[in-house]
Amino acid sequence: IVLRPSRVHNSEENTMRALTLKDILNGTFSYKTFFPNWISGQEYLHQSADNNIVLYNIETGQSYTILSNRTMKSVNASNYGLSPDRQFVYLESDYSKLWRYSYTATYYIYDLSNGEFVRGNELPRPIQYLCWSPVGSKLAYVYQNNIYLKQRPGDPPFQITFNGRENKIFNGIPDWVYEEEMLATKYALWWSPNGKFLAYAEFNDTDIPVIAYSYYGDEQYPRTINIPYPKAGAKNPVVRIFIIDTTYPAYVGPQEVPVPAMIASSDYYFSWLTWVTDERVCLQWLKRVQNVSVLSICDFREDWQTWDCPKTQEHIEESRTGWAGGFFVSTPVFSYDAISYYKIFSDKDGYKHIHYIKDTVENAIQITSGKWEAINIFRVTQDSLFYSSNEFEEYPGRRNIYRISIGSYPPSKKCVTCHLRKERCQYYTASFSDYAKYYALVCYGPGIPISTLHDGRTDQEIKILEENKELENALKNIQLPKEEIKKLEVDEITLWYKMILPPQFDRSKKYPLLIQVYGGPCSQSVRSVFAVNWISYLASKEGMVIALVDGRGTAFQGDKLLYAVYRKLGVYEVEDQITAVRKFIEMGFIDEKRIAIWGWSYGGYVSSLALASGTGLFKCGIAVAPVSSWEYYASVYTERFMGLPTKDDNLEHYKNSTVMARAEYFRNVDYLLIHGTADDNVHFQNSAQIAKALVNAQVDFQAMWYSDQNHGLSGLSTNHLYTHMTHFLKQCFSLSD
């Protein structure tokens, strides 16, 4: 199935050019999306091209600038946030990245009523997190690991926590492992819907082992970066959840929310918090052995000034075939009765679907069903539930938005996006205004991305928000590769693949093949999305065929495929890449003497194991920032899929699944190993151990390190990296430079 039809006509052929590496590195063909910053049912904010903050009213059609670019520029602001009462705006500047989501910044408060910055009781700097209350203009912020509250922007702050300490106690922000592997946010505090209460997490990292690495910088002596980082089997953070009344916070102080008894009996995690009403909150907990999750609904008892979490409001989710949930345990979306909720979890057939829980999980009513998966619940209103799934035409790599009418019986289902721009758009996300009065659809492909605004009642398209016209024009004289998404059926396993083919692809010819792999649990690489990236260039200019294959362990095709890798990482993911390569060879257009594999992170692990599989299929390969042993990676992620590295649990497979154990098998392949020395996520230790094992086995290999670079290898390192990898592949495939 050709998803990106070639626009090449013979008469135009001589005006067309191939993609260059420079195009990719310069981001020449990057696209834009438009996500409205909703502030009501019918209004949104957007930062214009000239950096004014503009308020749009959909119903009146009017727009006006609420904050000028001059004001933004006066403090070098790169971001903003309007208070819900529309009296103040915070301006964010001096952005300083920490980990994946976290950063610190300087914040200024601008008073819209008098057009001046708030003077007196200014915020300290740098701040780790800051947010408005959902109503009015209270501010909560985290500074030096402690939480502060301002009743009004000009008021002095009230300190809520006092025990915050760098790398020891984190209040209102996650530690490294919770940020990366559990919450996927930079914050760990949550306002109640009307701002009466503020809930927050406290993470105690006192007993966690520390990863230390050198940051070379420019000084005479390198700095040492220390991060409390629990690797598999190590001591984990201790988490507690507190709630404070923000009206009179100095009176009762923070109240701890009790942990369900069945969770508290052994090591556990807190996984998410969802406010239901101002006096009802829902907490989700997870056992350290991550196959049991408990959802606990707690109520504020005014007479006791405490949070009560009755056992009757505890809902248990358990997996008998793998871990609980997909990548994360799903979060509930509460209905208007403030007690029942909608949630995605596995049905009896092992497909993730929406369920409606009114009293117990056992009595849950299944809302969606089929041999496909519901992926995200966007919004529940009085009469509709909006969700995304990959049901349409049975392509797991697509995303369409559906509406289920829950106000009528029986509920009716409508695909909102399936037929909108069918060729161009098969992968959507959505953003809803209050009460789903309006929504924006963002289409990511396979054609050029487009963002549109829609009426929440009729689903009618109101206007195009961003259609990437400039990109479309720029691509008119580019010979883009062809892309196809198909599937292989092998031993009752369906292997979906995406193949990227050179523009003048001819099935009768032989092409070098590059496999790009990620393959991590609950990931998906074969998606109907638009991209002009490095592999597009390799196909367009260098004439390579590139393939991406979703094997066992990948997501959105049912639990059988997903949980196949449970407690066995590094086995089936590799097998399935190899199986796919053999099938590609059978197709007749692959030069079997010129096959390579590359991957980053988990993909670096899989590519390394594939190269060391002893099949003789691969001539060469690249591993960027690979995991090399699961004992080196984070507890929360690793143990979810592998259990514990103990004798009575899964130590044997931890040992068997290392890259180092296969050092000898690299002898007959060309291997390029790449890692950033300041990788906080997959530590440089992983590649250091691979290199040591290869040296000890007297196996030749190539390596590149990037000094002071993290897991993303950003900035100038990116250019160097892709240039270096290009040279390596061209040399491997005997392509002229």
């Epitope: 002095p156 006092f162 102080g253 007479d303 000034q305």
Partner: antibody, heavy 117, light 108 residues
Framework: EVQLLESGGGLVQPGGSLRLSCAAS????????MSWVRQTPGKGLEWVSA????????YYADSVKGRFTISRDNSKNTLYLQMNSLRAEDTAVYYC??????????WGQGTLVTVSS | EIVLTQSPGTLSLSPGERATLSCRAS???????LAWYQQKPGQAPRLLIY???SRATGIPDRFSGSGSGTDFTLTISRLEPEDFAVYYC?????????FGQGTKVEIK
């Protein structure tokens, strides 16, 4: 009806120790932060220490830090103040009060601590 | 720490008169964290006002509080005989919480 009843005060020599207790009733003791506030004869009020609902959250005035320890036993509905290395300037009526940093909506009747040789 | 200064030190008034007590903070205090107490000889303090202007349970409406930032006021609209006592303001904005030195309202 909320009641707070302090005990344990008395005469002690400088450098000595005393343990004050405060028995609480009429409210869910375990749900509230509690404080100790003292009043020197003929003088004003001075906050001494507070303890949060959750054990481990304790707060002290600089004048008593390292010498006094606040604690609570929720099973007994009792608040304590262990006072060591007492000084003459610690002489005061000690009140137990319901609340963290204020407002303090209920107070005990107070217990007199006299530090003198 | 925040120093609270109350004035006047003593206020001599007759029953039925209006009493205006002032409390000035050495630095800004958010109104949520300002309270007033009444203390009679031999008794413990009693909460009158919290949040600068909200009356505590059982407090007559002749007591009212106002103010923001650094200046706060307690007003007793018509003094009753039982109102003659010492009045303290208190802030809970910063640790340590602090009290004013007190204003004594005495019978003239």
């Amino acid at each position: 009806e909320v009641q707070l009843l302090e005990s344990g005060g008395g005469l002690v020599q400088p450098g000595g120790s005393l343990r004050l207790s405060c028995a609480a009733s009429g409210f869910t003791f375990s749900s509230y932060a509690m404080s100790w506030v003292r009043q020197t004869p003929g003088k004003g009020l001075e906050w001494v220490s507070a303890i949060g609902v959750s054990t481990g959250s304790t707060y002290y005035a600089d004048s008593v830090k390292g010498r006094f320890t606040i604690s609570r036993d929720n099973s007994k509905n009792t608040l304590y103040l262990q006072m060591n290395s007492l000084r003459a300037e610690d002489t005061a009526v000690y009140y137990c009060a319901k609340g963290w940093l204020g407002p303090f909506d209920y107070w005990g009747q107070g217990t007199l601590v006299t530090v003198s040789s | 720490e925040i120093v609270l200064t109350q004035s006047p030190g003593t206020l001599s008034l007759s029953p039925g008169e209006r009493a205006t007590l002032s409390c000035r903070a050495s630095q800004s205090v958010s109104s949520s964290y300002l309270a007033w107490y009444q203390q009679k000889p031999g008794q413990a303090p009693r909460l009158l006002i919290y949040g600068a202007s909200s009356r505590a349970t059982g407090i007559p409406d002749r007591f009212s509080g106002s103010g923001s930032g650094t200046d706060f006021t307690l007003t007793i609209s018509r003094l009753e005989p039982e109102d003659f006592a010492v009045y303290y303001c208190q802030q809970g904005q910063l640790i340590p919480p602090t009290f004013g030195q007190g204003t004594k309202v005495e019978i003239k």
